[in-house]
């Protein structure tokens, strides 16, 4: 590696993947194994992230970039850069501190993560339940009871917008 020659800061010429080694007269030295520098002019290299246990390696560490982790199957990532791994549950369950627990009656979860949410209350939109809800699925709302009676108008007013799967508290 070339000896740096900057008049202002001799370290500014050290490229990514190296560090400015004060012990060697500010020569640009390569980052040691299991470390990296992602920008030039660094006086130290950063230790590579280790992906072990609940984490597994998505991208290996290089001299210029940190390792990237994801989660071992059975768990999913949380947080920026997959800073945590959280347990998966089955559909129809939610994660609690006691582990995965079935959704209570009247609630559902159609994913492996997240919380159980209340079934949609069809009657709030003036509709009837077409398909009953389960632990894994929301109810399906059908036409209002009035729409099903003979001679009723086939036009129904639009339902107010509401977040899917949530009933107003």
């Amino acid at each position: 590696f070339e000896r740096t020659r900057s008049l202002q800061d001799p370290c500014s010429n050290c490229p990514a993947g190296t560090f400015c080694d004060n012990n060697r007269n500010q020569i640009c030295s390569p980052c040691p194994p299991n470390s990296f520098s992602s920008a030039g002019g660094q006086r130290t290299c950063d230790i590579c992230r280790q992906c072990k246990g609940v984490f597994r390696t998505r991208k290996e560490c290089s001299s210029t970039s940190n390792a990237e982790c994801d989660c071992t199957p059975g768990f999913h990532c949380l947080g920026a850069g997959c800073s945590m791994c959280e347990q998966d549950c089955k559909q129809g369950q939610e994660l609690t501190k006691k582990g995965c627990k079935d959704c209570c009656f009247g609630t559902f979860n159609d994913q492996k993560r997240g919380i159980c949410r209340p079934w949609t209350n069809c009657s709030l939109d003036g509709k009837s339940v077409l398909v009953n809800g389960t632990k894994e699925r929301d109810v399906v709302c059908g036409p209002s009871p009035a729409d099903l009676s003979p001679g009723a108008s086939s036009v129904t007013p639009p339902a107010p917008a509401r977040e899917p799967g949530h009933s107003p508290q």
């Epitope: 246990g53 609940v54 768990f75 949380l78 947080g79 800073s83 945590m84 791994c85 959280e86 347990q87 994660l95 609690t96 501190k97």
Partner: nanobody
Framework: EVQLVESGGGLVQPGGSLRLSCAAS?????NYWMNWVRQAPGKGLEW???????????YYVDSVKGRFTISRDNAKNSLYLQMSSLRAEDTAVYYC????????????????SGQGTTVTVSS
């Protein structure tokens, strides 16, 4: 550096017992929920048990209830898993893992885990 190191695994006969230990360093154990998780050969990762900061709350996956006991010694910065009445299906790599900041409130994410210790139950 934040680190967890598991030990105590080995080969044991069905019905036997084993005690796993996890030594924590680089952080104050008493500030965190702690967990044991395991990975059986060819299977996904499975949560086994957790314990709150002072040991007053402990929870287990159904398959180990009454057989496994999680405990901690904050003064020794150590976590334990006492396993008894072991079965072939308990064969796995066991990892100790720290509950991240906000565990049990905002999420149940684990942010640090060790390299694991292997438990083999076989006659």
């Amino acid at each position: 550096e934040v680190q967890l190191v598991e030990s105590g695994g080995g080969l044991v006969q069905p019905g036997g017992s084993l005690r796993l230990s996890c030594a924590a360093s680089g952080f104050t154990l008493s500030n965190y929920w702690m967990n044991w998780v395991r990975q059986a050969p060819g299977k996904g990762l499975e949560w086994v048990a957790n314990i709150n900061q002072d040991g007053s709350e402990r929870y287990y996956v159904d398959s180990v209830k009454g057989r496994f006991t999680i405990s901690r010694d904050n003064a020794k910065n150590s976590l334990y898993l006492q396993m008894s009445s072991l079965r072939a299906e308990d064969t796995a790599v066991y990892y100790c893992a720290r509950g991240g900041e906000g565990y049990g409130v905002d999420h149940y994410g684990l942010d640090v885990s060790g390299q694991g210790t292997t438990v083999t139950v076989s006659s």
